[in-house]
């Protein structure tokens, strides 16, 4: 249950994250770290840099307040898990400055990606043989 | 805005392959899962599979054995192939973005595909 | 797989009534569930998505709630758009199952 609230926030992320790719031109061009092809069992490590990462709004033009909002929706700590709970305590996980930095953009193509494997994973958990290749 | 159109043959022969094409325009397909949907006439939806932008698959086992979905992503491209079918294929063939993994934000208008000799 | 059953098959009602369509999973599945608004020879459209999270773009007169096995897509004032046929679809375990429709006729 507890599981299945974390994932349904997942997918709810998903949506932030593709709200605020529409404003990607109004965020810092900074560098930031971007998790990809993360390992099994290190998802919650690299969901975290993600959540970490100093994404922000470059304070120009009429969509600081929607790209606030949403920044703030993305960092939103989620409801503490037994299987996040397991991940925090590998020692084994990348720290988040090993991974590359990105600009805004593929920042946000990349914690999407995250977000989308993890749902993924969790929904062929529950069903035998689903993954077909 | 994403936008999705199916293309194919309209009348394919029982025993046959059906194969059909989406292409997606307005957005890449190298992220997402990309899927199909069917509905036979007078019938509700049914899911055949989706693909992700990986290239790993998730079918419908009731059609797993005669199913094989893939994507060409330097065409922004996904496609469908349906083997030996049957009267009981015809239907309207959706494709569809799955941007959530679990539900399908973005559809094409659908194809009609008729199995008949 | 999990049977999506929708209720009613079908609905008459008019301009600005408040509609309301049930759908039941044969098991539990949590959240995991989207609504769907389709017309005919049209796209089908994403309306809501875990069960009561309002797809960007669709009107705050949709919602979604429910959890479990039981679910409830509501039209508070229904306009002229919104004639079409309504469908469920679970995502707890694959495969995805949808329901049979629920369509919303001219009264």
């Known amino acids: 249950q507890g599981q299945d609230r974390h994932m349904i926030r997942m997918r709810q992320l998903i949506d932030i994250v593709d709200q605020l790719k529409n404003y990607v031109n109004d965020l810092v061009p900074e560098f930031l770290p971007a998790p990809e092809d993360v390992e099994t069992n290190c998802e919650w490590s690299a969901f975290s840099c993600f959540q970490k990462a100093q994404l922000k709004s470059a304070n120009t033009g009429n969509n600081e307040r929607i790209i606030n909002v949403s920044i703030k929706k993305l960092k939103r700590k989620p409801p503490s898990t037994n299987a996040g709970r397991r991940q925090k305590h590998r020692l084994t996980c990348p720290s988040c400055d090993s991974y590359e930095k990105k600009p805004p953009k593929e920042f946000l193509e990349r914690f999407k990606s995250l977000l989308q494997k993890m749902i993924h994973q969790h929904l062929s958990s529950r069903t035998h043989g689903s993954e077909d290749s | 805005q994403v936008q999705l159109q199916e293309s194919g043959p309209g009348l394919v022969k029982p025993s046959e392959t059906l194969s059909l094409t989406c292409t997606v325009s307005?957005?890449?397909?190298?992220?997402?899962?990309w899927g199909w949907i069917r509905q036979p006439p007078g019938k509700g939806l049914e899911w055949i599979g989706y693909?992700?932008?990986?290239?790993?698959?998730n079918y419908n086992p009731s059609l797993k054995s005669r199913v094989t979905i893939s994507v060409d992503t330097s065409r922004n491209q996904f496609s469908l192939k349906l083997s030996s079918v049957t009267a009981a294929d015809t239907a309207v063939y959706y494709c569809?973005?799955?941007?959530?993994?679990?539900?399908?934000?973005?559809w094409g208008q659908g194809t009609l595909v008729t199995v008949s000799s | 797989d999990i049977q999506m059953t929708q209720s009613p098959s079908s609905v008459s009602a008019s301009v600005g009534d408040r509609v309301t369509i049930t759908c039941r999973a044969s098991?539990?599945?949590?959240?995991?569930l989207a609504w769907y608004q389709h017309k005919p020879g049209k796209a089908p459209k994403l309306l809501i998505y875990?069960?009561?999270s309002l797809q960007s773009g669709v009107p705050s007169r949709f919602s979604g709630s429910g959890s479990g096995t039981d679910f409830t897509l509501t039209i508070s004032s229904l306009q002229p758009e919104d004639f079409a046929t309504y469908y469920c679809?679970?995502?707890?375990?694959?495969?995805?199952?949808f329901g049979g429709g629920t369509k919303v006729e001219i009264k």
């Open positions: 679809q679970q995502a707890n375990s694959f495969p995805l199952t």
């Open positions: 693909i992700s932008s990986r290239g790993s698959t």
């Open positions: 569809a973005r799955s941007a959530g993994v679990t539900d399908f934000d973005f």
């Open positions: 307005g957005g890449s397909i190298s992220s997402d899962f």
């Open positions: 098991q539990g599945i949590s959240s995991w």
């Open positions: 875990v069960a009561s």
